[in-house]
Amino acid sequence: KSSNEATNITPKHNMKAFLDELKAENIKKFLYNFTQIPHLAGTEQNFQLAKQIQSQWKEFGLDSVELAHYDVLLSYPNKTHPNYISIINEDGNEIFNTSLFEPPPPGYENVSDIVPPFSAFSPQGMPEGDLVYVNYARTEDFFKLERDMKINCSGKIVIARYGKVFRGNKVKNAQLAGAKGVILYSDPADYFAPGVKSYPDGWNLPGGGVQRGNILNLNGAGDPLTPGYPANEYAYRRGIAEAVGLPSIPVHPIGYYDAQKLLEKMGGSAPPDSSWRGSLKVPYNVGPGFTGNFSTQKVKMHIHSTNEVTRIYNVIGTLRGAVEPDRYVILGGHRDSWVFGGIDPQSGAAVVHEIVRSFGTLKKEGWRPRRTILFASWDAEEFGLLGSTEWAEENSRLLQERGVAYINADSSIEGNYTLRVDCTPLMYSLVHNLTKELKSPDEGFEGKSLYESWTKKSPSPEFSGMPRISKLGSGNDFEVFFQRLGIASGRARYTKNWETNKFSGYPLYHSVYETYELVEKFYDPMFKYHLTVAQVRGGMVFELANSIVLPFDCRDYAVVLRKYADKIYSISMKHPQEMKTYSVSFDSLFSAVKNFTEIASKFSERLQDFDKSNPIVLRMMNDQLMFLERAFIDPLGLPDRPFYRHVIYAPSSHNKYAGESFPGIYDALFDIESKVDPSKAWGEVKRQIYVAAFTVQAAAETLSEVA
């Protein structure tokens, strides 16, 4: 059968029918349904929601919907022994204690099982000592403290403001600096937008609001006790001392009312510059310790959380492909939330639900996609991307042979200004073409395309007339698919006009105030931005699953490879004498990129000309496209990060949320001037250039004519 016979309806009509079936009102209803009670990973409530989604996806018409369960390490506060932080006087008396819970939002006062704010996977402990304020606790903040200001954090409790980088990196940096405890807080400078009221009167963070979150440094491992393998019934589990990525010092998050009480007494060094000052009425002194009158007072942490092996449940739905059932396009997003999950994740889960419903409607009318579509509702994302990673570990052999693409579907909104897309370069043209066909939901862009409003509001820094598309980092469920398995991946959501605050999240992120009402009253009353995100995510899945030739353009990879090579060379050029002394050359990398560019160009020409009615040749060309992303995987992984195997992209070693290009070379060059053995350090730079050059050349050769 030809593709069109197999799928029953002409391709254009299919896509239109699919998009027209998506309804804002349904997304709104689903969001309401998913956010009335907490759905914390490992709880009965989240298991019940998994079964509800399984049942509804079956009703919507998927061929099969199964639960996939795993027993993974999770972390919970002790219900009878709460976590808090004190200021103690010289006699050890607690003269101030931080709050034990967030004041519940209106209408939610009687909801049970709201987990109090905590840092998941913090060890137990009751350290006491002087406080040091470490700004965002980034690598550069500790450099400033230790190298410029000569402040020693060893044996101190550090207090860091949330934002800029993933909280797990903050904790790792504090540990390396010798701290014995970490206090994380939300500063109004980062989580209170000027001119907006706090919840429930606006979308800003109130003083009693607190950001929950895990503080792991898993580097893609999944369940800390079963790295590399699924946490199934017969799993061998590591002892807790050998677990991957667990923090070694107690950590606890607080809101800015409590932070004010700690920071207002700080003495010691003044902040080094204005970038260390937030918006509280405190001096932002670095410390160590409190000022004169309060110098005998100390800070004490009381942390009693426990790590427990707990069952989690993914929901996996299948819509079998009519022509290539052994080729998988995956749409996945998580279901577990810290509390109500009004934005994270249920604004995404509601969109996935509506996409499934639309696909199911088409299927009931006799249509099938060309390729198989898998839908996933992941569990325990908030505890370290555990559900998605365990499932991918269990199914890695199928995925590496059959995985065409993965589209992520966490929060649909983090603002309502414009579109934000992070994806593999293979998907650039798909995203451009799709957004040109979709209507913009933005005020002032009536009758204009989404592409137009997106390009106007978020222009590419390199190419005029094109929108910005960012690199994939991590901190979400695409990680295992892209960074470990090399499956082409992408994500899309609506975002804020807040480029300077890129990684701080929206003000109410991971707080009790992330409710249905937050979305319905303040972010998207008409659910038009949710609908647009559904059209983008759903449209990408549709095209990936249904187009006869995969909608990947390998020439776009060539363009970015050249840009990334130039970037990493520019970083190395800051050390010209060392490059000369140790004969460091990037010529092999630039040569490989040039070869890739030429081969990709020829491949694209053949792609235009080949006989698409020949199923063998069609499959061959599509396989070359599908396996191109896979060709960037190094089976040995990156140094000390075996589950980050993509040579072109990895999460930054300094911020899990951000993507870094040529990460092996980048990390080898980072702070190289401080290395004790320069010869060894530059030898590693040369080795990483070799690995990168080889990988780019090898990937290029997968696009050459096969014989």
Partner: nanobody, 118 residues
Framework: EVQMVESGGGVVQPGRSLRLSCAAS????????MHWVRQAPGKGLEWVAT????????EYVDSVKGRFTVSIDNAKNTLYLQMDSLRAEDTATYYC???????????WGLGTLVTVSS
Amino acid sequence: EVQMVESGGGVVQPGRSLRLSCAASGFTFSSYAMHWVRQAPGKGLEWVATIYQDGSESEYVDSVKGRFTVSIDNAKNTLYLQMDSLRAEDTATYYCVGRDSTSITPVWGLGTLVTVSS
């Protein structure tokens, strides 16, 4: 032939200014970044400044920050280094370094000598 030629060097008193130019021929300034590197007499090579893409972003070694300004004129295919408040320690041969958008090896200029002396 692909080459870059620096000019504008000379002898100048401390506190005065100079403007170095680097004219490229045989290739266009479409690469990601262009660099200035210097070598003081009897010393090793030292990176001075980098300018990225369309000239919107630049970086400098700490010792020249606030005194030197790198710029680019794509139409003239020329890179510049404006050097103000010159000091004796700025005495060096200054090289421009770049890469054509299709080239494999970097292209270095022959250098121009700047001597800061009273």
